[in-house]
């Protein structure tokens, strides 16, 4: 049950984190016009990836996408490539772990599949949410050297009289939902992958208890982790290492492909 | 037929109140920012108040915390509200629309209503 | 505040001739978002309101006649009559619309 519940409220988290990752990308503020210490201006400007718009105090939004592909930055570039990856992996994710879910029966599939599906899932979510957090972070970085450098002259004279007010930009909206997006998504697939542990069934249908004896003990168990490798079933003995007797019943353990997490 | 009609204006004396009125037909008043703008005798245009679409407000610095512009949707009417009136106040008061796609020039006005301070 | 200069003051003019006005803001009205300038020119005649005339800095409003051309960007701006007529007699304003408050020149006089 707690199992079902955690791989279930993974697969919720994940989902909105995803959802607020594609947000964050189409967003159009992903920069806006720092209005600290400027003139009380009739014309905003705010920035997304896509393109950048102006609204005016009549109530008028402009905005004009980035026709360009050479022409712009390639930190911008790459704030797109790594929200698109991580949207692209999260929707496989999504996918992914639909099928994985204890809760829907999909034909005769064994826990094993549902164990490993679960497990890529929840990895492509952690990577979802870090390409989310990672292409944030690079826009914000760009955007604190930018403010810093225009602060730097942003007020240039023209003959003493005259001053041009270079338009500083900060943090925009877009940035707050993907910081938030990408770790909701980080944190669904770090319970994606718990809930693998769980699904993962270590023994077969009768129970095996294992004896230590008084020395170094080995014990032997029929069917280990039919989830080893790949989707299909693996029915090699595997060697466990344990020092008291245990069922199935408890929790496991051993070390397994499923232990980094 | 876009028309601005002001009223409300007259003769009143320094520390005295009056409310300005401007009625907006031929278009969607709530789809407009609004202004108003002033003339004075020496026949200087001075910008007053604008007050937009989403209820932002903005005043000239020297009119701050006397005048209130406010507007009512439903009536199709711009108000201006003047307290604490002073000589240097005595003016045409006009009501004027920025249009939409006009980069916030002010595209109508209306006939104006005069405003005179005086004991 | 921004203050906006206009030059010259008074203008006489005979008809077809070609007049040109300035106007000079103290801070630019340029906005780098949308490359466009925040700077509209009205015509005011005896006994009426302003009428729009310019806006951007050098589109026409409509309806407003081809013999009238705002130019310029930035801090200095300029509007011009290519051949006057008689109806064009009148004051010109320009005003800031970038910056509150939106202030307005002084006007230039177009007279005989």
């Known amino acids: 049950m707690a199992v079902t519940a955690c791989q279930g409220l993974g697969f919720v988290v994940s989902l909105i984190g995803i959802a607020g990752i594609i947000a964050a990308t189409c967003m159009d503020q992903w920069s806006t016009q720092d209005l600290y210490n400027n003139p009380v201006t009739a014309v905003f400007n705010y920035q997304g990836l896509w393109r950048s718009c102006v609204r005016e105090s009549s109530g008028f939004t402009e905005c004009r996408g980035y026709f360009t592909l050479l022409g712009l930055p390639a930190m911008l570039q790459a704030v797109r490539a790594l929200m698109i990856v991580g949207i692209v992996l999260g929707a496989i994710g999504l996918l992914v772990s639909i099928f994985a879910l204890k809760c829907i029966r999909i034909g005769s599939m064994e826990d094993s599949a549902k164990a490993n599906m679960t497990l890529t899932s929840g990895i492509m979510f952690i990577v979802s949410g870090l390409c989310a957090i990672a292409g944030v972070s690079v826009f914000a970085n760009m955007l604190v050297t930018n403010f810093w450098m225009s602060t730097a002259n942003m007020y240039t004279g023209m003959g003493g009289m005259v001053q041009t007010v270079q338009t500083r930009y900060t943090f925009g909206a877009a940035l707050f939902v993907g910081w938030v997006a990408g770790g909701l998504t980080l944190i669904g697939g770090v319970m994606m992958c718990i809930a693998c542990r769980g699904l993962a069934p270590e023994e077969t249908n009768y129970k095996a208890v294992s004896y230590h004896a008084s020395g170094h003990s080995v014990a032997y168990k029929p069917g280990g982790f039919k989830a080893s490798t790949g989707f299909g079933s693996n029915t090699k003995n595997k060697k466990i290492y344990d020092g008291g007797a245990r069922t199935e019943d408890e929790v496991q353990s051993y070390p397994s492909k499923h232990d980094y997490v | 037929e876009v028309k601005l009609v002001e009223s409300g204006g007259g003769l009143v004396k320094p520390g005295g109140s009056l409310k300005l009125s401007c009625a907006g037909s031929?278009?969607?008043?709530?789809?407009?920012?609004m202004s108003w703008v002033r003339q004075t005798p020496e026949k200087r245009l001075e910008w007053v108040a604008t007050?937009?679409?989403?209820?932002?407000?903005y005043y000239l610095d020297s009119v701050k915390g006397r005048f209130t512009i406010s507007r009512d949707n439903a009536k199709n009417t711009l108000y201006l509200q003047m307290n604490s009136l002073r000589s240097e106040d005595t003016a045409l008061y006009y009501c004027?629309?920025?249009?939409?796609?006009?980069?916030?020039?002010?595209?109508?006005w209306g006939q104006g209503t005069s405003v005179t301070v005086s004991s | 505040d921004i203050v906006m200069t206009q030059s010259p003051t008074s203008l006489s003019v005979s008809a077809g001739e070609k007049v040109t006005m300035t106007c000079k803001s103290s801070?630019?009205?340029?906005?780098?978002?949308?490359?466009?300038?925040?700077l509209a020119w009205y015509q005011e005649k005896p006994g009426q309101p302003p009428k729009l005339l310019i806006y951007?800095?050098?589109t026409r409003e409509s309806g407003v006649p081809d013999r009238f051309t705002g130019s310029g960007s930035g801090t200095d701006f300029t509007l011009t009559i290519s051949s006057v007529q008689a109806e064009d007699l009148a004051v010109y304003y320009c005003?800031?619309?970038?910056?509150?408050?939106?202030?307005f020149g002084a006007g230039t006089k177009l007279e005989l």
């Open positions: 004027t629309r920025l249009g939409q796609t006009q980069r916030n020039a002010m595209d109508y």
């Open positions: 005003q800031n619309v970038h910056f509150y408050p939106f202030t």
């Open positions: 951007g800095a050098s």
């Open positions: 801070q630019s009205l340029f906005n780098s978002g949308n490359q466009k300038n925040y």
């Open positions: 031929g278009f969607t008043f709530s789809s407009y920012t």
């Open positions: 007050i937009t679409i989403g209820v932002n407000i």
